[in-house]
Interface confidence: low
C-alpha cells in the first residue's frame, strides 16, 4: 500500500475565466507506476464523478496525461486524475476543485457620503458578478499620507474606520482583485465637508399668531457638525389629513437660518410640518426629514355668508304667516373657526329690524302680510361674516321670472340639473329635491347656487331608483321669482313589480283590457311603455306594445267561448318586470245574439 | 407616506420589449431621484438606471446602455423604463427606488430611502 499519492494534478487550485479553455495534466510518480504496473495510458479523468471523452485526453509520456476543457461554464468541477490498477480496479491519484469566474470589472459610480456623527461610507458598483471570492478595498489618501484600507464585506459598499478631516482633499478609490485578476477605479478627489448627510433637524415648534390667521412660525435646532457648517433649509408642509406635501420654494430657505415663518395658510387649519437640511452650498447630502409637528393657524371670521332660504308654512288666519328661516352650516373652509352663533335681522317695510341670535340653523316667525328683508350672519369668536339678504314679499305678490328649459340627467354617480336663466338679473338660485313616496312624506332637502350657475349637481346623498322632485327656484333682489319642477332618477332600474291588468268589458270577439299605474314607489325609473302578452291554452303566444300614458287597452280578432290567459309587463330604461297572470273567458254568443 | 408602485412587468420573448412604470406618491416629486433597480434569487439587488426628476440627467448600467431608456412624466408623477432588446440575462424583480438625499444622479442602491413592491420581468428564449 503507498501511503504518498501515486502522483499530482497541475495546476493544484485551478481557476478558469469562463468562456475559455482549460487543460490540466496529472503526473504520475514513477514508484506509482511499478507498484501499479500501470502508465499514463490507465488514467481516467473525471468531472464530478463521471469520465471525461477519451477525446479530451493526451497521454504527452509514460507518466504524463493532459486533458483539456473548451468554453468553460460551470461555476465548479471536481475534477480527479484515477488509474485502472491492475488493468481493472479504479484507484484515485489526486484531485482538485476547478472553479470558473471573471476577473472583476473595473468597479464604477463611486460616491462617498459622510452621515453626521458617523464615519464614511463609500459605495460603488462593482458592475457583473464574479462568481469567485473577490476582495475589495476601499483605498485612501491625502496629498501627503496614506489612510488605512477598508476591507469591504459585501462587495459594494465600505464603512472608513478613520474619522473624516474636513476642509482637505481626499482621494478615494476602489480596488477590487480575485484569482483571476485586479483592477482599480477611477479616483475621486473631494472635501468631506462636501459629501456630509447632516442629522435631521430637531425640537420642530409650530406656533400661530393672533394678528395673522394666514401665518404659522416654525422653529428648530440644527446640528450641521456641532455648528461647523452653514446649513440651508427645506420646509414641506400639509393639511392635517392630506397626504401630498406642499413645498415652501427653496430659495425662500437658502440661508442658514432657525425659523421661518409660512404664509398664505388657510385660516383655523392644522398643519403638519417638517424640514430637513443640507450645507448652504448645496454639496453633499440632504439630511433625513425632522420629526414631524403640527399647528393650527389662528381664526378669521367667517369668508362669506351661509345659503339662506326660507318656507311659509299655510297660515292660520288672514293677518299672519308663519315664515321658517333655514340656512345651512358654513364649511370649515368658509367657517374660518368655531360658528358661535347667527344673528338674523328682521326688517318690516321702512320700519323697525328686529334682531335674533341663533345657535341652530333656522328660525320660525309670524309674520303681518307685509314685506319683510331678512339679513343673516354667521359669528366665530373673530368677528361676523358678511351679510345674506333674503327679501320675502307679500303673499299678495305674484311671483314672476321662472327659469326655462329645467332639465336634469345622471353623469358620474350624480345626479345634474341644468336651465336657463331667466330675463331678470338674478341674485342667486335655490334647487330644493325630495323623494317623491306614496308611503312617506316628501322630505326636502336644499342648496344655494351662485347667480352665475347654471348647472349644478344635487349635493346631497341620493339613492338609486328613487324617484326625486327637484324644483328650481330663481332669487331676485325683490323676492324669489316662480319655481319650476321635474323629476329625475340618480340610476333607474327594472319596476319592482308589474300591473295588475283586469277586464274592463269582455265581448265574443274582443276584451277590454284596464290596469292602475304602477305606484311610484315601485316603478324605480320612468315608464316607458307596457307590453301585453295574451294566448290561449293551445295557441301561440301574441305581444302588443302600449305607450306609458294608457291605462286600458282593447283586444281585438278574439275568437268566441275561449279561455284567454293575459299578462303585463312595464317597461323602464333599465329593464322589464311582469305582473300576475290574468285570465278570462269570451261568451260564445254576442249580446242579443241566438243561437 | 411615500409610496412606490410599480406596474408593467410580464414575460417577453428574448429580443423583445417592455416597458415599466412606477408611480410616486406622498411627497414633493420635483426633489427626488428615481432609480430602477433587478434583483434574482439568491443575487443582490443592482442598480439598472436612475434620472434626476428636477434636472433630468440619467445614468444607466453598463449591461443595459443602448438598450434601456429610464424617463419621466412630472405631470403623472410617474417613472418609465423602456427595456428593448431584452436577454435572457435581464430576467428578474424589478423595483423602483426614491431617493431624496442625494445630489447627483447615483445607481448605487444604499443611497435610496423608499422602495417599491417590485414588478417581475421574465425573458424566455
Known amino acids: 500500500q503507498l501511503l504518498e499519492p501515486c502522483g499530482y494534478i497541475y495546476p493544484e487550485f485551478p481557476v478558469v475565466q469562463r468562456g475559455s479553455n482549460f487543460t490540466a495534466i496529472c503526473v504520475l510518480k514513477e514508484a506509482c507506476l511499478q507498484h501499479y504496473y500501470v502508465n499514463a495510458s490507465y488514467i481516467v479523468w473525471k468531472t464530478n464523478h463521471a469520465a471525461v471523452p477519451r477525446e479530451q485526453v493526451t497521454v504527452i509520456n509514460r507518466t504524463t496525461s493532459s486533458v483539456t476543457f473548451t468554453d468553460v461554464v460551470l461555476p465548479s468541477v471536481q475534477l480527479t486524475c484515477n488509474i485502472l490498477s491492475f488493468g481493472q480496479i479504479e484507484q484515485n491519484v489526486y484531485g482538485v476543485t476547478m472553479l470558473s469566474g471573471f476577473p472583476p470589472d473595473k468597479p464604477t459610480n463611486l460616491t462617498c457620503i459622510v452621515n453626521e456623527g458617523k464615519n464614511m461610507l463609500c459605495q460603488w458598483d462593482p458592475g457583473r458578478e464574479t462568481y469567485l471570492e473577490t476582495n475589495y478595498t476601499l483605498k485612501s489618501e491625502w496629498a501627503t499620507e496614506k489612510f488605512p484600507d477598508c476591507q469591504s464585506k459585501h462587495g459594494t459598499s465600505c464603512m472608513v474606520s478613520y474619522m473624516p478631516t474636513y476642509y482637505v482633499n481626499i482621494e478615494v478609490w476602489v480596488e477590487a482583485e480575485n484569482a483571476l485578476g485586479k483592477v482599480s477605479s477611477e479616483s475621486i478627489n473631494f472635501d468631506p465637508v462636501d459629501k456630509v448627510k447632516p442629522t435631521p433637524p430637531y425640537n420642530l415648534s409650530v406656533t400661530n399668531s393672533e394678528e395673522l390667521s394666514s401665518i404659522l412660525k416654525l422653529s428648530w435646532v440644527s446640528s450641521g457638525l456641532g455648528g461647523l457648517l452653514d446649513l440651508k433649509s427645506d420646509i414641506q408642509y400639509r393639511t392635517k389629513d392630506a397626504s401630498t406635501w406642499i413645498q415652501v420654494p427653496l430659495e425662500d430657505t437658502m440661508s442658514p437660518r432657525t425659523s421661518f415663518t409660512v404664509q398664505d395658510l388657510k385660516p383655523f387649519t392644522e398643519y403638519v410640518f417638517r424640514i430637513r437640511s443640507i450645507k448652504d452650498s448645496g454639496k453633499g447630502y440632504w439630511s433625513d426629514w425632522s420629526e414631524e409637528a403640527s399647528g393650527t393657524t389662528y381664526e378669521d371670521r367667517p369668508s362669506r355668508p351661509p345659503s339662506f332660504w326660507y318656507k311659509t308654512n299655510p297660515s292660520h288666519g288672514q293677518e299672519y304667516r308663519s315664515v321658517r328661516l333655514i340656512w345651512k352650516a358654513l364649511p370649515l373652509s368658509e367657517a374660518n373657526g368655531k360658528i358661535l352663533d347667527y344673528e338674523v335681522i328682521l326688517t318690516q317695510s321702512k320700519s323697525v329690524s328686529q334682531t335674533y341670535t341663533v345657535t341652530g340653523t333656522e328660525l320660525t316667525v309670524n309674520l303681518t302680510n307685509d314685506r319683510y328683508v331678512a339679513s343673516l350672519a354667521a359669528r366665530n369668536k373673530v368677528g361676523k361674516s358678511a351679510a345674506a339678504v333674503l327679501t320675502i314679499p307679500s303673499p299678495h305678490v305674484t311671483a314672476a321670472y321662472s327659469v326655462v328649459n329645467l332639465k336634469a340627467f345622471p353623469k358620474d354617480n350624480l345626479l345634474w340639473v341644468e336651465w336657463t336663466p331667466p330675463p331678470k338679473p338674478v341674485s342667486k338660485y335655490i334647487l330644493e329635491w325630495c323623494v317623491l313616496s306614496e308611503n312617506a312624506p316628501c322630505v326636502e332637502d336644499w342648496q344655494q347656487e351662485d347667480a352665475t350657475v347654471n348647472r349644478t349637481h344635487l349635493r346631497g346623498r341620493l339613492l338609486e331608483s328613487k324617484c326625486y322632485q327637484i324644483t328650481v327656484t330663481p332669487v331676485f333682489a325683490t323676492g324669489p321669482g316662480g319655481s319650476e319642477s321635474l323629476k329625475a332618477y340618480l340610476k333607474q332600474a327594472a319596476p319592482a313589480r308589474g300591473p295588475t291588468v283586469r277586464t274592463k268589458k269582455v265581448g265574443k270577439n274582443e276584451a277590454v283590457l284596464a290596469w292602475d299605474q304602477i305606484p311610484v314607489d315601485d316603478q324605480n325609473g320612468f315608464i316607458r311603455n307596457y307590453s301585453i302578452s295574451y294566448r290561449t291554452s293551445v295557441g301561440k303566444e301574441m305581444v302588443v306594445h302600449v305607450d306609458s300614458s294608457h291605462t286600458e287597452y282593447t283586444l281585438s280578432s278574439l275568437s268566441s267561448d275561449t279561455l284567454y290567459m293575459v299578462r303585463m309587463a312595464a317597461y323602464t330604461d333599465e329593464g322589464g318586470k311582469d305582473g300576475p297572470e290574468f285570465t278570462f273567458t269570451t261568451p260564445k254568443f254576442a249580446q242579443g245574439e241566438i243561437e | 407616506q411615500v409610496q412606490l408602485q410599480e406596474s408593467g412587468g410580464g414575460s417577453v420573448q428574448a429580443g423583445g420589449s417592455l416597458r415599466v412604470s412606477c408611480v410616486i406618491s406622498?411627497?414633493?416629486?420635483?426633489?427626488?431621484?428615481m432609480g430602477w433597480f433587478r434583483q434574482v434569487p439568491g443575487k443582490e439587488r443592482e442598480g439598472v438606471a436612475a434620472?434626476?426628476?428636477?434636472?433630468?440627467?440619467?445614468i444607466y448600467a453598463n449591461s443595459v446602455k443602448g438598450r434601456f431608456t429610464i424617463s419621466q412624466d412630472s405631470s403623472k408623477n410617474t417613472v418609465y423604463l423602456e427595456m428593448n432588446g431584452l436577454k435572457l440575462e435581464d430576467t428578474g424583480m424589478y423595483y423602483c427606488?426614491?431617493?431624496?438625499?442625494?445630489?447627483?444622479?447615483?445607481?448605487?442602491?444604499?443611497?435610496?430611502?423608499?422602495w417599491g413592491q417590485g414588478t417581475q420581468v421574465t425573458v424566455s428564449s
Open positions: 434620472i434626476s426628476t428636477g434636472g433630468g440627467s440619467t
Open positions: 427606488a426614491a431617493s431624496t438625499v442625494i445630489t447627483s444622479v447615483s445607481i448605487n442602491r444604499g443611497l435610496y430611502q423608499y
Open positions: 406622498g411627497f414633493t416629486y420635483r426633489q427626488t431621484f
